[in-house]
């Protein structure tokens, strides 16, 4: 499992399916993004690879998901962090890891935290270490709202399609 | 809470409800499986007990969920692990705990990891210990796709209906 | 991120949107509650503030969500706990942290655990500490069912709209 995700060749094979009609339903806005594994010190979301997709109006701009239609959406994200033994040098103070989904809306001119998870890791005490964070919830969103993420501990991310992702779907 | 889940007699009483129509909607494929608590060294999914169910085409075969209709599904799973120290204050190797939801599809002949969570636990350091992992996301699936799980640390699973589960529903 | 959530004045501005029609859909029951940050030693759910809402029949009574219509619902909750060490590197008893979503139904006269997450924290070893728990799953519920939560470690909750929440929506 640590080597999660697909090899480059497998990733080519496993491109997202062509747009499909939802089981027993008309299409509804949905998106699933994965963290770009080629960018090691940033978290850039990608929609055109592996299992990722944008459907029925969702778009990705400036690393944010743009909400296509007003309504209630389930929004979710996961990150996995890892580290090596004794990677800290002259400290035993904990490493602060956090992941947040934020909303930027025309209604108020600042980023509102929607989902936040946090962890302190003591790398000198626990070597090597791995930690996963997941969260998701339903929110009333307005057309044009921007959903983005903020992460503390980006250099420690385990970037693969199954470990670091961000998505939303209309209910 | 450690004694989560129902007693055997209560489980009899609490069998899943008869199939019900979804609030304000036609039925859509949905499934919720629980880990069989009678199997201590394996993770066998069950649909015919407690709060578990299979609805509108989902089926369980070879410990995998079979996708009934092409479309976008939200897929989720949780595990809870627990353990005791090997020996008080003893130095021990870390225990690698991981849980993954995998896709096996006719489109490519290998298991693709969809959702992965991982953790290192240092039992000698922290005794007793408990750890929960949850993940879920939206995926484009094709009729006949097989959803399964792979778990590292199965002997440490806390098998009850509310702690170890696996499910999916069409959006 | 620890200072997540809105300031009181911003919270006024950011009250939930007026009831909106779901993208491409008729309304369906949905609810998202947040932990009341003014109550430090209890977990009281609120629906009339920040991003929280009750829609299409959901109501909040005696700190429980009342299910408005029989059907399948996705139910979810998150908590974040934090604390400081009793004394640096001191050996201390573990702190048991747990969060559970429970169902009380007319069908059987006791609380059934639906979702449970648990953690042992060793404050003397790890100071300060932070831990997040999330879970969610699909359940067949009946009109009048009551969904509530039980938490061990309430004094350690990080009460903000983005860290402690509880919700459900009809599929």
């Amino acid at each position: 499992l640590p080597g999660v995700g697909l090899t480059p060749s497998a990733a080519q094979t496993a491109r997202q399916h062509p747009k499909m009609h939802l089981a027993h339903s008309t299409l509804k806005p949905a998106a699933h993004l994965i963290g770009d594994p080629s960018k090691q010190n940033s978290l850039l979301w990608r929609a055109n690879t592996d299992r990722a997709f944008l459907q029925d109006g969702f778009s990705l701009s400036n690393n944010s998901l743009l909400v296509p239609t007003s309504g209630i959406y389930f929004v979710y994200s996961q990150v996995v962090f890892s580290g090596k033994a004794y990677s800290p040098k002259a400290t035993s103070s904990p490493l602060y890891l956090a992941h947040e989904v934020q909303l930027f809306s025309s209604q108020y001119p600042f980023h509102v935290p929607l989902l936040s998870s946090q962890k302190m890791v003591y790398p000198g005490l626990q070597e090597p270490w791995l930690h996963s964070m997941y969260h998701g919830a339903a929110f009333q969103l307005t057309q044009g709202d921007q959903l983005s993420t903020h992460t503390d501990g980006i250099p420690h991310l385990v970037l693969s399609p199954s470990t670091v992702f961000f998505g939303a779907f209309a209910l | 809470l450690p004694g989560v889940g129902l007693t055997p007699s209560a489980a009899q009483t609490a069998r899943q409800h008869p199939k019900m129509h979804l609030a304000h909607s036609t039925l859509k494929p949905a499934a919720h499986l629980i880990g069989d608590p009678s199997k201590q060294n394996s993770l066998l999914w069950r649909a015919n007990t407690d709060r578990a169910f299979l609805q509108d085409g989902f089926s369980l075969s070879n410990n995998s969920l079979l996708v009934p209709t092409s479309g976008i599904y939200f897929v989720y799973s949780q595990v809870v692990f627990s353990g005791k120290a090997y020996s008080p204050k003893a130095t021990s190797s870390p225990l690698y705990l991981a849980h993954e939801v995998q896709l096996f599809s006719s489109q490519y002949p290998f298991h693709v990891p969809l959702l992965s969570s991982q953790k290192m636990v240092y039992p000698g350091l922290q005794e007793p210990w408990l750890h929960s992992m949850y993940h879920g996301a939206a995926f484009q699936l094709t009729q006949g796709d097989q959803l399964s799980t792979h778990t590292d640390g199965i002997p440490h699973l806390v098998l009850s209906p509310s702690t170890v589960f696996f499910g999916a529903f069409a959006l | 991120l620890p200072g997540v959530g809105l300031t009181p004045s911003a919270a006024q501005t950011a009250r939930q949107h007026p009831k909106m029609h779901l993208a491409h859909s008729t309304l369906k029951p949905a609810a998202h509650l947040i932990g009341d940050p003014s109550k430090q030693n209890s977990l009281l759910w609120r629906a009339n503030t920040d991003r929280a809402f009750l829609q299409d029949g959901f109501s909040l009574s005696n700190n429980s969500l009342l299910v408005p219509t029989s059907g399948i619902y996705f139910v979810y909750s998150q908590v974040v706990f934090s604390g400081k060490a009793y004394s640096p590197k001191a050996t201390s008893s573990p702190l048991y942290l747990a969060h559970e979503v429970q169902l009380f139904s007319s069908q059987y006269p006791f609380h059934v655990p639906l979702l449970s997450s648990q953690k042992m924290v060793y404050p003397g070893l790890q100071e300060p500490w932070l831990h997040s728990m999330y879970h969610g799953a699909a359940f067949q519920l009946t009109q009048g069912d009551q969904l509530s939560t039980h938490t061990d470690g309430i004094p350690h909750l990080v009460l903000s709209p983005s860290t402690v929440f509880f919700g459900a929506f009809a599929l």
């Epitope: 002259a90 005490l125 626990q126 503390d152 250099p155 | - | 590197k89």
Partner: antibody, heavy 114, light 113 residues
């Protein structure tokens, strides 16, 4: 290239206050604690305390509690040390450091004198 | 607080000499679970910031010459310079990061004989 750059030092009157800045660049700032260490002229090193910029958590040397306050602005990748009720014996070079990676700034001299 | 005591407080040596500096802590810095000693060694030259040499008692920082080595466990630690070079004349400090407050030794000044 990783750099920690302190600023804000100078001459201060006894009883006065000052705010030192520590600007970090070349690495992600928020997850790693910034430590403050001072060194009086011709003396050894003394740990003042530390702050986790992302979480806002702090640890103070009891000798400085009440007179020292740590803060951080993640958007500016900068940590701050506010020192109040300064005395002559607070005259020192003040360093910020990231113990996780082993980086230290060049230091800034604070002189408390009338 | 953990007290850190270095000896000697100063020493005179020649280029090529083997130099040993000791550091004693008032309580053990060994964390038994992972057998790690929470001790670092720094080098400081006049007018400059301290430079990390050794961490976890015996791990050399990147770029630090191999003539520097750290040893010891529990309460007794040693910094050794196997063959003193002209650029090594400086003051050396040990520091514990086992508990708060972090504390330093009083320093050992290595001077040219």
């Amino acid at each position: 290239e990783v750099q920690l750059v302190e600023s804000g030092g100078g001459l201060v009157q006894p009883g006065g206050s000052l705010r030192l800045s520590c600007a970090a660049s070349g690495y992600t700032f928020s997850s790693y604690w910034i430590e403050w260490v001072r060194q009086a002229p011709g003396k050894g090193l003394e740990w003042v305390g530390e702050i986790s910029p992302g979480s806002g958590s702090t640890n103070y040397n009891e000798e400085f509690k009440g007179r020292a306050t740590f803060s951080a602005d993640n958007s500016k990748n900068t940590a701050y040390l506010q020192m109040n009720s300064l005395r002559a014996e607070d005259t020192a070079v003040y360093y910020c450091a990231d113990g996780y990676h082993g980086y230290w700034g060049q230091g800034t001299l604070v002189t408390v004198s009338s | 607080d953990i007290q850190m005591t270095q000896s000697p407080s100063s020493l005179s040596a020649s280029v090529g000499d083997r130099v040993t500096i000791t550091c004693k802590s008032s309580q053990s810095l060994l964390y038994s679970t992972n057998q790690a000693n929470f001790l670092a060694w720094y080098q400081q030259k006049p007018g400059k910031a301290p430079k990390l040499l050794i961490y976890w008692a015996s791990t050399r920082d990147s770029g630090v010459p191999s003539r520097f080595s750290g040893s010891g466990s529990g309460t007794d630690f040693t910094l050794t310079i196997s063959s003193l070079q002209p650029e090594d004349f400086a003051t050396y400090y040990c520091q514990q990061y086992y508990s708060y407050p972090r504390t330093f030794g009083q320093g050992t000044k290595v001077e040219i004989k």
